[in-house]
């Protein structure tokens, strides 16, 4: 055969694709030291031949690193993981104003990549509130502002408000409002908002309660309508009459003010006196009639009854026999136009 089929080797082989810079799958997160418990900071990166922590600009001793290697399940790539512990003492030993911080540095053949800085702070929550809510008495339907400035803390304390030990949720009761500076606003105070209110501040270290503020929602009293005037005290002439009202519209509640003004009014009254009727004198006797009787009359006019006075009692007419019974009885007939007068006078007699 010939050499024509033989291959000529190149001066250099094409290189494998360049390894990329390390990429952080997990960067160290800010952490808080609670009491004396150290915190763990962790990094994961690929591709990475080495990962080390640097804290406050100083490399952390290799002995303080715990390193692991493994496969990332999602990508199948080889991943390097490293973690360190930071103690309370280390953080306290850092002098100056800057917080204690750590970051990871990862190497690959392509170079290095730095992670974000993670800050490590000692967590605390001071005991005393900067401002505690004050109890107050407020009128019904008015606005209430309860102020609370929680104790200084790291991390900053979250605040919630309790109403008689139940957490207030403004999404459930829109009459309540919480503000960014931790104030509680009651939009329109209802009687049911009379309660003990407590501001609670909490973070990962502790939970603190403010002094309890008692809110009393009161109702000032209001007068009812006046009742009708009573009858005049005297049936006749000058007297008094009165009317009353009550402090029940509404009645005072929760220490609200009693109604101002009078519950009772009195006024003079004059009732025109009734005049009872009285008889005039009897008239003279009439001449003796064919019926052998004579009459006399009187009127209820001395005076007549006035202003509801009583009528006269007794008869208007009086009659008596004028011939000692010697008249003939048959002269009286039923057709006699005056016969009804005799019938009307109950004490007249016929003979």
């Amino acid at each position: 055969g010939t050499d024509s089929g033989s291959e000529v080797l190149p001066d250099s082989f094409p290189s494998a694709p360049a390894e990329p810079l390390p990429y952080f799958l997990q960067e160290p997160q800010d952490a808080y030291i609670v009491k004396n418990k150290p915190v763990e900071l962790r990094c994961r990166a690929f591709p990475a031949t080495q990962i080390y922590f640097k804290c406050n600009g100083e490399w952390v001793s290799q002995n303080d690193h715990v390193t692991q290697e493994g496969l990332d399940e999602a990508t199948g790539l080889r991943v390097r993981e490293v973690q360190i512990e930071v103690s309370r003492q280390q953080v306290e030993e850092l002098f100056g104003l800057e917080d204690y911080w750590c970051q990871c540095v990862a190497w690959s053949s392509a170079g290095t990549t730095k992670s974000r800085r993670a800050y490590v702070r000692i967590a605390y929550l001071r005991k005393n509130f900067d401002q505690e809510p004050l109890g107050k008495e407020v009128p019904l339907d008015h606005e209430v502002l309860l102020q609370c400035r929680p104790p200084e803390g790291v991390p900053v304390a979250e605040v919630e408000w309790l109403k008689n030990e139940d957490v207030i949720d403004p999404t459930q009761d829109t009459n309540f409002l919480l503000t960014i500076d931790h104030n509680l606003i009651i939009r329109q105070a209802r009687l049911s908002d009379t309660a003990n209110y407590t501001c609670v501040a909490k973070n990962i270290v502790a939970k603190r309660r403010s002094t309890t503020a008692t809110v009393i929602v009161y109702v000032n009293g209001g007068w009812s309508s006046w009742a009708e005037w009573s009858p005049c005290s005297n049936r006749c002439g000058r007297g008094w009459q009165k009317r009353t009202r009550t402090c029940t519209n509404p009645a005072p509640l929760n220490g609200g003010a009693f109604c101002e003004g009078q519950a009772f009014q009195k006024t003079a009254c004059t009732t025109i006196c009734p005049v009872d009727g009285a008889w005039t004198e009897w008239s003279k006797w009439s001449a003796c009639s064919t019926e052998c009787a004579h009459w006399r009359s009187r009127e209820c006019m001395a005076p007549p009854p006035q202003n509801g006075g009583r009528d006269c009692s007794g008869t208007l007419l009086d009659s008596k026999n004028c011939t000692d019974g010697l008249c003939m009885q048959n002269k009286k007939t039923l057709s006699d136009p005056n016969s009804h007068l005799l019938e009307a006078s109950g004490d007249a007699a016929l003979y």
């Epitope: 339907d141 008015h142 502002l145 403004p170």
Partner: antibody, heavy 115, light 106 residues
């Protein structure tokens, strides 16, 4: 019936002062927050300052801080806005309103800052 | 300060239309949002408080809702008297208003 009535507006030169009043009736101003809100001609609403007398609480917009002072005389049931070092950009109708959700407003008073 | 970004700045609609106005808060404002209606030369009027509570005397065609930091005012069926400018307002932090939405007749 709840009512708010503003007064005290007018024409003032730049650098001058003005005091606005907000007379309240139908409710006790001592137990309610009062807010001043302004509206420049043809513009939107801008919050200026707030007071809650019972808690001696006041707050101001950055644009007026140090120049304006909000106060209240609860015996007169009236809130005030003292405006000093006035600027042309303070020209607006000034409203007072009651409550954080401002359920009642006055009719407004016009403040014109011009030379 | 907390910003309230209101959109749209204006809209044209007809009587009977459903109208939606949105406000986005630059950070959490809880439910401390109110909506107002203002007509030319008049003071604003409260429509909605606490994001979704209808103020007394306001017609039920007005409603408010919240989704996170997004707040919506809806007019279910626009009436002739509803043509006006609408503002949102937050009072969770220092009070701020949206820029306003002018609802005009189409």
């Amino acid at each position: 019936e709840v009512q708010l009535v503003e007064s005290g507006g007018g024409l003032v030169q730049p650098g001058g002062s003005l005091r606005l009043s907000c007379a309240a009736s139908g409710f006790n101003l001592y137990y309610s927050s009062i807010h001043w809100v302004r509206q420049a001609p043809g513009k939107g609403l801008e919050w200026v300052a707030s007071i809650y007398s019972y808690s001696s609480y006041t707050s101001y917009a950055d644009s007026v801080k140090g120049r304006f002072t909000i106060s209240a005389d609860t015996s007169k049931n009236t809130a005030y806005l003292q405006m000093n070092s006035l600027r042309a950009e303070d020209t607006a109708v000034y409203y007072c309103a009651r409550g954080y959700a401002m359920d009642y407003w006055g009719q407004g008073t016009l403040v014109t800052v011009s030379s | 300060d907390i910003q309230m970004t209101q959109s749209p700045s204006s809209l044209s609609a007809s009587v009977g239309d459903r109208v939606t106005i949105t406000c986005r808060a630059s950070q959490s404002v809880s439910s401390a949002v109110a909506w107002y209606q203002q007509k030319p030369g008049k003071a604003p009027k409260l429509l909605i408080y606490s994001a979704s509570s209808l103020y007394s005397g306001v017609p039920s065609r007005f409603s408010g809702s919240r989704s996170g930091t997004d707040f919506t005012l809806t007019i279910s069926s626009l009436q002739p008297e509803d043509f006006a400018t609408y503002y949102c307002q937050q009072h969770y932090g220092l009070i701020t208003f949206g820029q306003g939405t002018k609802v005009e007749i189409k």
